[in-house]
């Protein structure tokens, strides 16, 4: 049984059952407007890809990584440091499957900080590990300017002022 700050997820022989009832197929709204259906079965199959990773009690495992969903709110930089202090980093989203997993485990529909900000040095959106965002996968709604940081809401990525206070997600 995997316990997150959001919902309980359980993989049983390739199918997920969870405390909060979702339909078997979730709609993923990709930011360019296209849609892709991702089943709970897909989520469980990909999550079981690396069973060797074991997360700490308050962290949720998915695809060989561990995720922690905050309950409080901080600015982007304070959220960034909070994750660092726990030898983790703000969420880096690699693909739509991961986005779907994150969305299913978010309790509320408000903005949540992720590890993406606009760096004036590179003049581009950059993940906290230094890699650029893949514009073919993700589209960021809002201005690309200094002091812009990214937050997710309902599977979309938004540009927000970094000093705004939102919940956040750590990952390792």
């Amino acid at each position: 049984l995997l316990v997150s700050q959001g919902v309980l997820l359980k993989c049983q022989k390739g199918s997920c059952s969870n405390a909060t009832q979702y339909e078997d197929t979730g709609d993923l709204k990709v930011n360019n407007g296209t849609r892709r259906n991702i089943s709970n079965k897909d989520l469980c199959a990909s999550r079981s890809a690396d069973q060797t990773v074991l997360c700490q009690s308050e962290w949720l495992k998915y695809q060989g990584k561990c995720y922690w969903f905050s309950n409080e709110m901080k600015s982007w930089s304070d959220s960034y440091v909070y994750c660092l202090e726990r030898k983790s980093h703000l969420l880096i989203i690699h693909d739509q499957l991961e986005m779907a997993f994150i969305q299913k485990n978010l309790r509320q529909l408000n903005y949540v900080w992720i590890g993406l900000n606009f760096t004036s040095l590179k003049m581009t959106w950059t993940w906290v590990d230094g890699s650029p965002i893949d514009s073919k996968i993700f589209f960021i709604k809002g201005p690309a300017k200094e002091n812009s940081c990214a937050a997710i809401k309902e599977s979309k990525i938004f540009s927000e002022t970094c000093s705004s206070v939102f919940k956040w997600i750590c990952q390792y």
Partner: antibody, heavy 122, light 110 residues
Framework: QVQLVESGGGVVQPGGSLRLSCAAS?????????ICWVRQAPGKGLEWIGC?????????CYATWAKGRFTISKDLSKNTVYLQMNSLRAEDTAVYYC?????????????WGRGTLVTVSS | DIQMTQSPSSVSASVGDRVTITCQAS??????LAWYQQKPGKAPKLLIY???ILESGVPSRFSGSGSGTDFTLTISSLQPEDFATYYC????????????FGQGTKVEIK
């Protein structure tokens, strides 16, 4: 050479206070790692006291038993971390070590000081 | 706070023996566990971190295993310099981090 040196230990009366220092050389107290205090009573095991984050936040965390009586702080200009101990008791008699957590993704205290002895006695 | 429970508290062994020390966390700590060796009058020395990763310079006769709540330190063939006290240390990544030690295991000469 990267090292930590503790100082400030000595004999103190029950109910008294003491401030221990942990000075760094070979690196600076600013980075993505924790500086921690650990103690060891005579003939006993290691006991974690608490830590301070070397980064800008300066976050601190303490063992439940240490909260309230023990305070960890840092002075970046002196490259030193402090352990303020109040309301000392006989059972606080121990060698006090400071240790540095690595800046990597793993939890490990890879740098230790030699320790300073605190004796609480009347 | 998490609690670390180490066993046995002491073990008598001879040179060449295989020695196993266990450590149990009160809740899952993933693989966030380190092992230290301490000799009288000295500061602890890091042996293993990440539950199974050998610190640089540590002999390969030392090995660590486990994840979640149960961990093991093994010395495959005890050497004279290995007689010491061994401690496990867990790391808690929660909102209130903590780094508790186990009670220690003294490895003595039989």
């Amino acid at each position: 050479q990267v090292q930590l040196v503790e100082s400030g230990g000595g004999v103190v009366q029950p109910g008294g206070s003491l401030r221990l220092s942990c000075a760094a050389s070979g690196f600076s107290f600013s980075g993505n790692y924790w500086i921690c205090w650990v103690r060891q009573a005579p003939g006993k095991g290691l006991e974690w006291i608490g830590c301070i984050y070397a980064g800008s936040s300066g976050s601190t965390c303490y063992a439940t038993w240490a909260k309230g009586r023990f305070t960890i702080s840092k002075d970046l200009s002196k490259n030193t971390v402090y352990l303020q101990m109040n309301s000392l008791r006989a059972e606080d008699t121990a060698v006090y070590y400071c240790a540095r957590d690595t800046g990597s993704g793993y939890w490990k205290y890879n740098i230790w000081g030699r320790g300073t002895l605190v004796t609480v006695s009347s | 706070d998490i609690q670390m429970t180490q066993s046995p508290s002491s073990v008598s062994a001879s040179v060449g023996d295989r020695v196993t020390i266990t450590c149990q966390a009160s809740q899952s700590i993933g693989r966030d566990l380190a092992w230290y060796q301490q000799k009288p009058g000295k500061a602890p020395k890091l042996l293993i971190y990440g539950a199974s990763i050998l610190e640089s310079g540590v002999p390969s006769r030392f090995s660590g295993s486990g994840s979640g709540t149960d961990f093991t330190l093994t010395i495959s063939s005890l050497q004279p310099e290995d007689f010491a006290t061994y401690y496990c240390q867990g790391a808690d990544r929660s909102s209130t981090p903590s780094w508790p030690f186990g009670q220690g295991t003294k490895v003595e000469i039989k």
